[in-house]
Interface confidence: low
């Protein structure tokens, strides 16, 4: 039975041109973790393995970095990065789990939700 | 403490294998990756391989596929690194090391194993 | 495979002296490196990861910096344990590489 639970940074925005943290937590069991996914719409962005550590989708490289953790940051947002964002937890022996997180990247100066997630 | 036993020093004919075993305490077994490295002559250091004692997945560096092949035994919380076809190049001291999921650097180390391999 | 990069491959220094080593890396690993310690005909120890956090029970005169492909170690103040051979890492993915080593001399 999958008893676990993930946690996410929920619906989070961020200013053009800057960057966010996309956090995911899977909590509430002990199953073993074997991969990450995180994925934007139908597109891979990024993949951190537990024998093979993290990779990046080519197409990616210059605007996404590994972690914190398994997180993953954004760099240089343009408005066409608003959207969804998934978090896959690939696990044994529960199977998968999946959490979702929307970005809405603003034109704005002020970006009102998801601050704590910021980075300067 | 965590700790990473390995045997004294080998010495083995050319042609022939070696079983180099590395038995871990102090710690859950399947929480941590294995890997193995080879340093050569007090030479910079070459990982082999690692693997995942949880599951048995191993991955190795290209150079030494078909030389290396690493097993684990859950009971004992031993893991192996058998060479085969052993030639004056494989002449070196071998470590096994935990690693850390999801950022394989390397926290403990074994005290190492020198092969010698010679006639 | 990454390649690592480190310089100088050997120095000499006096107790007191600060030192940095450098490592660069052959394409972007982002923060992932790893720093060891390793004396004669001992086991590596593990310094740094993730270039600048410090191992648990690491002396606060270590430190790492660095991001992309270039990294370094400072020593401030070197204390006669700290002579021997230094190795970075990267732990970005497999294969993991180490540089060629620093070996760190006493004056």
């Known amino acids: 039975m999958m008893t676990g639970t993930i946690e996410t940074t929920g619906n989070i925005s961020a200013e053009k041109g800057g960057s966010i943290i996309l956090q995911c937590h899977l909590s509430s069991t002990t199953a073993q973790v074997t991969q990450v996914n995180w994925e934007q719409q139908d597109q891979l962005l990024a993949i951190c393995n537990a024998d093979l550590g993290w990779h990046i989708s080519p197409s990616f490289k210059d605007r996404v970095a590994p972690g914190p953790g398994l997180g993953l940051t954004l760099q240089s947002l343009t408005v066409n990065d608003t959207g969804e964002y998934f978090c896959i937890y690939h696990t044994y022996p529960d199977g998968t789990y999946t959490g979702r997180i929307f970005l809405e990247v603003l034109e704005s100066s002020v970006a009102e939700h998801g601050a704590r997630f910021q980075i300067p | 403490q965590v700790q990473l036993q390995q045997p004294g020093p080998e010495l083995v004919k050319p042609g022939a294998s070696v079983k180099i075993s590395c038995k871990a305490s102090?710690?859950?077994?399947?929480?941590?990756?294995m890997n193995w490295v080879k340093q050569s002559n007090g030479k910079s250091l070459e990982w082999i391989g690692v693997?995942?004692?949880?599951?048995?997945?191993?991955n190795y560096n290209q150079k030494f596929k078909g030389k290396a092949t690493l097993t684990v035994d859950q009971s004992s919380s031993t893991a192996y690194m058998q060479l085969n076809s052993l030639t004056s190049e494989d002449s070196a001291v071998y470590f096994c090391?935990?690693?850390?999921?999801?950022?394989?650097?390397?926290?403990?180390w074994g005290q190492g194993t020198t092969l010698t391999v010679s006639s | 495979d990454i390649v690592m990069t480190q310089s100088p491959a050997s120095l000499s220094a006096s107790v007191g002296e600060t030192v940095t080593i450098t490592c660069r890396a052959s394409?972007?690993?982002?923060?992932?490196l790893a720093w060891y310690q390793q004396k004669q005909g001992k086991s590596p120890q593990l310094l740094v990861f993730?270039?600048?956090t410090l191992t648990e029970g690491v002396p606060s005169r270590f430190s790492g910096s660095g991001s992309g492909t270039q990294f370094s170690l400072k020593i401030n103040s070197l204390q006669p344990e700290d002579f021997g051979s230094y190795y970075c890492?990267?732990?970005?993915?497999?294969?993991?590489?180490f540089g060629g080593g620093t070996k760190l001399e006493i004056k």
């Open positions: 102090g710690y859950s077994f399947t929480d941590y990756n």
């Open positions: 993730n270039a600048k």
């Open positions: 090391a935990r690693g850390v999921y999801f950022g394989n650097y390397f926290d403990s």
């Open positions: 693997i995942n004692p949880n599951s048995g997945t191993d």
């Open positions: 890492q990267h732990h970005y993915g497999a294969p993991w590489t």
């Open positions: 394409e972007n690993i982002y923060s992932s």
